[in-house]
């Protein structure tokens, strides 16, 4: 049994890091393998993660971690029984994938303005809470070409757009994702999408 692709890990910069790797053949990850991890810190203890299968030869492990700070470094040991298959380390702050925003809501009762709001996925004491920016994706269910991205570079988790920038009388969907420039993170997953029917009063034409 050998490791074909070494573990690569990403952190949500809160409490979970996810590590994925591939073995050289079909493997029952949960029965055959264990990933041991430990924060390099005087008051830390070793933890064991039981991996799950992720495709025939792929394995994935969800590591429960202490609140992350930038200096953290974890040692990782991948074992198959008594055999050490791979040894490495992981700095969560260098491999961050933020949590996805939640509670995306479209408020349509503001005069001819759409107000989209969502929740910051981090608690106020987390470093990323004040460092996230967002991308909002809006698309038409009827017209695949009617697809747009709005970049929200301010901290407030909201976006206002004129309802008239979208077509009236048809249904739209929206979703939102986050990233943090300070740690050069990847984008989060998209939030679940929300649907609304876009309708607004057309301005009277002057003749």
């Amino acid at each position: 049994m050998k490791v074909l692709q070494e573990p690569t890990c990403v952190s949500d910069y809160m409490s979970i890091s996810t590590c994925e790797w591939k073995m050289n053949g079909p493997t029952n990850c949960s029965t055959e393998l264990r990933l041991l991890y430990q924060l390099v810190f005087l008051l830390s203890e070793a933890h064991t993660c039981i991996p799950e299968n992720n495709g025939g030869a792929g394995c994935v492990c969800h590591l429960l971690m202490d609140d992350v700070v930038s200096a953290d470094n974890y040692t990782l040991d991948l074992w198959a029984g008594q055999q050490l298959l791979w040894k490495g380390s992981f700095k969560p702050s260098e491999h961050v994938k933020p949590r996805a925003p939640g509670n995306l809501t479209v408020h349509t009762n503001v005069s001819d303005t759409l107000l989209l709001t969502w929740s910051n996925p981090y608690p106020p004491d987390n470093y990323l809470y004040n460092h996230l920016t967002y991308a909002v994706n809006i698309w038409s269910e009827n017209d695949p070409a009617d697809f747009r991205i709005y970049n929200v570079t301010y901290l407030e988790p909201s976006l206002r757009i004129a309802a008239s920038t979208l077509k009236s009388g048809i249904s739209y969907r929206a979703r939102v994702r986050a990233w943090a420039q300070c740690y050069n993170t990847t984008w989060s997953e998209w939030s679940p999408s929300t649907k609304w029917h876009n309708s607004y009063r057309e301005p009277f034409e002057q003749h």
């Epitope: 409490s15 390099v40 810190f41 005087l42 008051l43 830390s44 203890e45 971690m65 202490d66 609140d67 700070v69 930038s70 200096a71 953290d72 608690p123 106020p124 004491d125």
Partner: antibody, heavy 115, light 109 residues
Framework: EVQLVQSGGGLVHPGGSLRLSCAGS????????MFWVRQAPGKGLEWVSG???????NYADSVKGRFTISRDNAKNSLYLQMNSLRAEDMAVYYC?????????WGQGTLVTVSS | EIVLTQSPGTLSLSPGERATLSCRAS???????LAWYQQKPGQAPRLLIY???SRATGIPDRFSGSGSGTDFTLTISRLEPEDFAVYYC??????????FGQGTKVEIK
């Protein structure tokens, strides 16, 4: 808002015991290492003890064998049991959250050791 | 055990002046594990700088940290009245734990 609220200081005779408490709020207590740091009157800061999220502990040589740090994650609370107290243990004791450094501190509680 | 020595013991300056505080370690310290605190009379210390140069949340940009190895510096670019206090450096070591410098008092001249 992160808050650490301390209680339990007071006057104790040499050789006596005292228990300090620290209640945390505004953060996930169970995922953070916690510490006690003290400051003798007119002196500098001295790290006393720390406890990790899994319960691993460490002590300054000056208190080893006499002080015991503990935590109750269900109550979001940190404790310091101080036995065989000496005159040199007299100080303001602070609880703190942190790891390699201490980012939030309690208000401090005075421990007076005197006969 | 790593010993941190701060200098000067006292710094007498006027508001608006630049303050430069030194922290010297008896052996090399990882920059990731060097922090600075401010303490005012009757108050708990407050984290100013961590990782030798990163400002903690809510700390004004007139405070900056620098250095590596055994020599670290805290600089206050323009002293405000509320900056007169005692400043401590602190380091963490994987074997020895946490130690503080003896402090530098910044007082009004």
């Amino acid at each position: 808002e992160v808050q650490l609220v301390q209680s339990g200081g007071g006057l104790v005779h040499p050789g006596g015991s005292l228990r300090l408490s620290c209640a945390g709020s505004g953060f996930t207590f169970s995922r953070n290492a916690m510490f006690w740091v003290r400051q003798a009157p007119g002196k500098g800061l001295e790290w006393v003890s720390g406890i990790g999220t899994g319960g691993a502990t460490n002590y300054a040589d000056s208190v080893k064998g006499r002080f015991t740090i503990s935590r109750d994650n269900a109550k979001n609370s940190l404790y310091l049991q101080m036995n065989s107290l000496r005159a040199e243990d007299m100080a303001v004791y602070y609880c703190a959250r942190g790891r390699y450094y201490f980012d939030y501190w309690g208000q401090g509680t005075l421990v007076t050791v005197s006969s | 055990e790593i010993v941190l020595t701060q200098s000067p013991g006292t710094l007498s300056l006027s508001p608006g002046e630049r303050a430069t505080l030194s922290c010297r370690a008896s052996q090399s310290v990882s920059s990731s594990y060097l922090a600075w605190y401010q303490q005012k009379p009757g108050q708990a210390p407050r984290l100013l700088i961590y990782g030798a140069s990163s400002r903690a949340t809510g700390i004004p940009d007139r405070f900056s940290g620098s250095g590596s190895g055994t020599d670290f510096t805290l600089t206050i670019s323009r002293l405000e009245p509320e900056d007169f206090a005692v400043y401590y450096c602190q380091q963490y070591d994987h074997s020895a734990g946490w130690t503080f410098g003896q402090g530098t008092k910044v007082e009004i001249k």
